[in-house]
């Protein structure tokens, strides 16, 4: 009979690509089916896998928080890369949030390092700074 076009809201979701596992593993950008017979592609922009694996589901893409900029988007083989906005940094011991960089050094100290997305400004005592200057002259 005549083929009926589906209304936009009824359109079937595209089938995820399938292939066979190799040595029981699926390549980056895929996860394995429950029965272990198929490799199913991750959904671009939604989830990913970085290595050969037998994950039952791909890993959810990270969403950059407000206060972060997206350096690179999530692909099927790589998670989103987020970086703190200018003037803020992320510390190793509190990686969940970006903190404001200090605007200046305390009295008696001088700045020897700028604010970066991964470190606050660096301050040292004036005497230490003078010694460093002599050392690197």
């Amino acid at each position: 009979g005549p083929s009926m076009a589906l209304a936009p809201q009824q359109r079937a979701a595209p089938q995820q690509k399938r292939s066979s596992p190799s040595e029981g593993l699926c390549p980056p950008g895929h996860h394995i089916s429950e029965d272990g017979r198929d490799c199913i592609s991750c959904k671009y922009g939604q989830d990913y896998s970085t290595h050969w694996n037998d994950l039952l589901f791909c890993l959810r893409c990270t969403r950059c928080d407000s206060g972060e900029v997206e350096l690179s988007p999530c692909t099927t083989t790589r998670n989103t890369v987020c970086q703190c906005e200018e003037g803020t940094f992320r510390e190793e011991d509190s990686p969940e949030m970006c903190r404001k960089c200090r605007t200046g050094c305390p009295r008696g100290m001088v700045k020897v390092g700028d604010c970066t997305p991964w470190s606050d400004i660096e301050c040292v005592h004036k005497e230490s700074a003078a010694a460093l200057e002599v050392l690197f002259q």
Partner: nanobody, 126 residues
Amino acid sequence: EVQLLESGGGLVQPGGSLRLSCAASGRTFGSIRVGWFRQAPGKGREFVSAINRNDGTTYYADSVKGRFTISRDNSKNTVYLQMNSLRPEDTAVYYCAAGLQYNRAADRVPVGAVYWGQGTLVTVSS
């Protein structure tokens, strides 16, 4: 969220035995293969053993082959590591891991994992 909980660690004399358990909660193990890694004091994490939960295929590091046996009970969502003929060099924190990651399909040794337990300490000493 996949959560792995190890138990069974402790102090044992050289030549002794221990059985470690790894129970999964949440979306089960999140992968077909489940493994054990260990980390000795001051050293990096090293692969110990893995098992396929569907067909029971097992994998072992050369250092534990013939002494350690990995097994699973799918009805209990648990993987076991039976450790016999223990040596002082087996002293380490043992971690259960799932979502094992490999650089190539043919590799027998995973380079890491997605999901980790909190670890259980095994001390082999007289």
